[in-house]
C-alpha cells in the first residue's frame, strides 16, 4: 500500500499526477467525503493513471455476490475483485470519465472496448450505467447494452427479463434481458469454456458461449 | 410517463430576450438524464441549442453561446432558455426533450409538443 | 461541427417499398447516431438510438446500421402511416448535429 498518510486521492490519475508511478493498491478518498477505499492503479497502461474497477483472472473470487457487497466492493485490488458501485458512481458524477475494458481469450488473443464517456447513476436509480464514444477492437456494436440498464444481482432484480438474469448467469451486471454480455459470470478454466451461457461473456468479440480467460475494467478522467 | 411541455410568448421584437419554460412532469430532472432546448426553423432544419443535465451544469451550442442561457428551479421542475438579441432568424418552433445521457450530448427520447416563437416589430 | 450530409431530400413510393435513407458524417460519429421521425404538427419522435438499437415500441419494420462515418436508416414494408420526415442526428460530439431531412410522401 503506498498511500502516504497526508495525501487525499480520489482516483489513479490524481495518484499518478503525485509522482506515484508504479503498479499498486493505493488508498482512495470517495469524494466529498472522508471515507476510503483501496484500489489497484496500473500506472503503465495507455499513459497510465487507470483505476480499475473490476479484474478476471483465475477464478479465485466468487462473483455470485449481494447487491450490497457489488455496492461496497469485494475481492482483493491485487488480484480478482470489483472496486464498488457507490465509489464508482460518486466518482463518475464528479467529472467525465472514460471507461477500457481489456478482454483476453483463452488462445493469446486480447481486444478491448473504450468508451469515452461513462458514468453510473446513483444506488436511488440502481447504477444505471451509461456510455458513450465506442471505439476499439472488441466489437463494433457495444456488448452492454446501451442505453445503460440498470444493475443487478442475485438479490436485486432490476433487469427486463421475467427469468432473473442474475440468478441464472450468476454475476452482478448491467443486464438488459439478458444482453450480450457479463463479465461476473462464472469463471471456466481453460477446455471449458464454450457452449457456457453463464459465463464471462462479451458477445460482440468472442460470441454468445465463449467465456472469457482475463477481464479488466478500468477507468480514468477524460480529460487525463 | 414523462412529459414535457414548452410555455412562452409566442412573439418577441427584435433586439429583446426570447424566454421559454419547459415544465417536466413525471421524471425528476435532478435524478438522472440532460434537459434540451431544441428548434426547428422554417424549412424544418434542426438544431441543438444546449442542455442542462440532472447535476445542474450546463453545455451550450458555440454558435449561440454569448447568447444563450439555461437555467432551472428544481422546486418546480422546470427549465429555462433566455436567448438574448434576438432577430428575425430565431423564428423557429422551439422544443424541449430529454436525452438519454447525464454528462454530455445524446439521442433525446423524449420531446415536449414545440412552441411557436416569431421574432417581428 | 460534425457536418451530417442525409440523402435523398424526397423520397416518393408506394405503400409496400422498401425505402433507404443515408447520412454520412464529416468525421467519424462512432456508433453515436440516432434516426427520428417527425410526422407533420407533431414533434420528433425517436426511432434508432446507437445507430441500430430501435427504441421501445418502435415497429420492427424500422432499421438502422452503420458505423464511423456512413449511417443507413431503412423501412422494410413502407405503410401509410410513415408519412413524415426523418432525420438523423450524431451525438459523438458536441454540438449534436442533424441531418437535413428526408420526406417521405406516399403517391
Known amino acids: 500500500d503506498y498511500k502516504d498518510d497526508d495525501d487525499k486521492f480520489r482516483d489513479c490519475a490524481e495518484v499518478f499526477k503525485s509522482g506515484h508511478t508504479t503498479n499498486g493498491i493505493y488508498t482512495l478518498t470517495f469524494p466529498n467525503s472522508t471515507e476510503e477505499i483501496k484500489a489497484y492503479c496500473d500506472m503503465e497502461a495507455g499513459g497510465g493513471g487507470w483505476t480499475i474497477i473490476q479484474r478476471r483472472e483465475d477464478g479465485s473470487v466468487d462473483f455470485q455476490r449481494t447487491w450490497k457487497e457489488y455496492k461496497v466492493g469485494f475481492g482483493n485490488p491485487s488480484g480478482e475483485y470489483w472496486l464498488g458501485n457507490e465509489f464508482v458512481s460518486q466518482l463518475t458524477n464528479q467529472q467525465r470519465y472514460v471507461l477500457k475494458i481489456h478482454l483476453k481469450d483463452w488462445e493469446g488473443n486480447e481486444a478491448y472496448s473504450l468508451y469515452e464517456h461513462f458514468y453510473l447513476s446513483s444506488e436511488e436509480l440502481n447504477y444505471r450505467i451509461h456510455l458513450k464514444g465506442l471505439t476499439g477492437t472488441a466489437g463494433k456494436i457495444s456488448s452492454i447494452s446501451q442505453p445503460g440498464n440498470d444493475f443487478s444481482t442475485k438479490d436485486g432484480d432490476n433487469d427486463k427479463c421475467a427469468c432473473k438474469c442474475s440468478q441464472m448467469l450468476t454475476g452482478g451486471w448491467w443486464f438488459d434481458a439478458c444482453g450480450p454480455s457479463n463479465l461476473n459470470g462464472m469463471y471456466y478454466p481453460q477446455r471449458q469454456n464454450t457452449n457456457k451461457f453463464n459465463g464471462i461473456k462479451w458477445y460482440y468479440w468472442k460470441g454468445s458461449g465463449y467465456s472469457l480467460k482475463a477481464t479488466t475494467m478500468m477507468i480514468r478522467p477524460a480529460d487525463f | 410517463d414523462v412529459q414535457l411541455q414548452e410555455s412562452g410568448p409566442g412573439l418577441v421584437k427584435p433586439s429583446q430576450s426570447l424566454s421559454l419554460t419547459c415544465t417536466v412532469t413525471g421524471y425528476s430532472i435532478t435524478s438522472d438524464y440532460a434537459w434540451n432546448w431544441i428548434r426547428q426553423f422554417p424549412g424544418n432544419k434542426l438544431e441543438w441549442m444546449g442542455y442542462i443535465s440532472y447535476s445542474g451544469s450546463t453545455s451550450y451550442n458555440p454558435s449561440l453561446k454569448s447568447r444563450i442561457s439555461i437555467t432551472r428551479d428544481t422546486s418546480k421542475n422546470q427549465f429555462f432558455l433566455q436567448l438574448n438579441s434576438v432577430t428575425p432568424e430565431d423564428t423557429a418552433t422551439y422544443y424541449c426533450?430529454?436525452?438519454?445521457?447525464?454528462?454530455?450530448?445524446?439521442?433525446?427520447?423524449?420531446w415536449g409538443q414545440g412552441t411557436s416563437v416569431t421574432v417581428s416589430s | 461541427s460534425i457536418v451530417m450530409t442525409q440523402t435523398p431530400k424526397l423520397l416518393l413510393v408506394s405503400a409496400g417499398d422498401r425505402v433507404t435513407i443515408t447520412c454520412k458524417a464529416s468525421q467519424s460519429a462512432s456508433n453515436d447516431v440516432a434516426w427520428y421521425q417527425q410526422k407533420p404538427g407533431q414533434s420528433p419522435k425517436l426511432l434508432i438510438y446507437y445507430a441500430s438499437n430501435r427504441y421501445t415500441g418502435v415497429p420492427d419494420r424500422f432499421t438502422g446500421s452503420g458505423y464511423g462515418t456512413d449511417f443507413t436508416f431503412a423501412i422494410s414494408t413502407v405503410q401509410a402511416e410513415d408519412l413524415a420526415i426523418y432525420f438523423c442526428q450524431q451525438d459523438y460530439s458536441s454540438p449534436p448535429t442533424f441531418g437535413g431531412g428526408t420526406k417521405l410522401e406516399i403517391k
Open positions: 426533450a430529454r436525452s438519454t445521457f447525464g454528462h454530455y450530448v445524446s439521442s433525446m427520447d423524449y
